[in-house]
């Protein structure tokens, strides 16, 4: 297993609809044709897997059917979107990238993106 650098933004603010997007960029040392991307959430010293995807270079990401994530790839960049977030989901979201094929296997883990989620205030009753 060889190490690889992964870059991601430090902070992202989710939209009022609970959607957060960020770019995960990896420094590919070779010409990988198969990549796995995993998003991990770290909160209160606990790490959980949020979603994972694989793709063959030049094609779209494939997530599991029930995934809350979507994404696209372009070169060595993966654009990730996480949906359905609420205030309790605020935390550090870490991007993990694995170059699966061809060998050698490379693994890179980003420093994480702190995603802040603010639940929208309910709309006040209108007199109209």
């Amino acid at each position: 297993c060889k190490a690889m650098h992964v870059a991601q933004p430090a902070v992202v603010l989710a939209s009022s609809r609970g959607i957060a997007s960020f770019v995960c960029e990896y420094a590919s040392p070779g010409k990988a044709t198969e990549v796995r991307v995993t998003v991990l959430r770290q909160a209160d010293s606990q790490v959980t897997e949020v979603c994972a995807a694989t793709y063959m270079m030049g094609n779209e990401l494939t997530f599991l059917d029930d995934s809350i994530c979507t994404g696209t790839s372009s070169g060595n960049q993966v654009n990730l979107t996480i949906q359905g977030l609420r205030a309790m989901d605020t935390g550090l979201y870490i991007c993990k990238v694995e170059l699966m094929y061809p060998p050698p296997y490379y693994l890179g883990i980003g420093n994480g993106t702190q995603i802040y989620v603010i639940d929208p205030e309910p709309c006040p009753d209108s007199d109209f």
């Epitope: 063959m56 779209e60 494939t62 599991l64 699966m100």
Partner: nanobody, 115 residues
């Protein structure tokens, strides 16, 4: 475990056509990508084309306009239509299954392009 069975390889003259098929069976995930790789003697295995469950495709520059990948999700089968074959297309063609949970290779089918 997923089993991949390729067929359709053979000997063809330059300029000719072949259609490769790959049937996936076993514990198949709901969403996955299928691809075709090829490996000529003494060379590294290279990605020729890939297709996702939703039908999104990608073809290597060297085969664009000549090869077309397609799939029949109901039959868990992926096809590679190869037209205007050249001697440099000769190789063992491998089917590839890639999902979030697993990845598998087929045993390969030989394509020979010679007059």
């Amino acid at each position: 475990q997923v089993k991949l069975e390729e067929s359709g390889g053979g000997l063809v003259q330059p300029g000719g056509s072949l259609r490769l098929s790959c049937v996936a069976s076993g514990s198949i995930d709901s969403t996955y990508t299928m691809g075709w790789y090829r490996q000529a003697p003494g060379k590294q295995r290279e990605l020729v084309a890939s297709i996702t469950s939703s039908g999104s495709t990608n073809h290597a520059d060297s085969v664009k306009g000549r090869f077309t990948i397609s799939r029949d999700n109901a039959k868990n089968t992926v096809y590679l239509q190869m037209n205007t074959l050249k001697p440099e297309d000769a190789a063992v063609y491998y089917c590839r299954y890639l999902s979030v949970l697993s990845a598998y290779w087929g045993q390969g089918t030989q394509v020979t392009v010679s007059s």
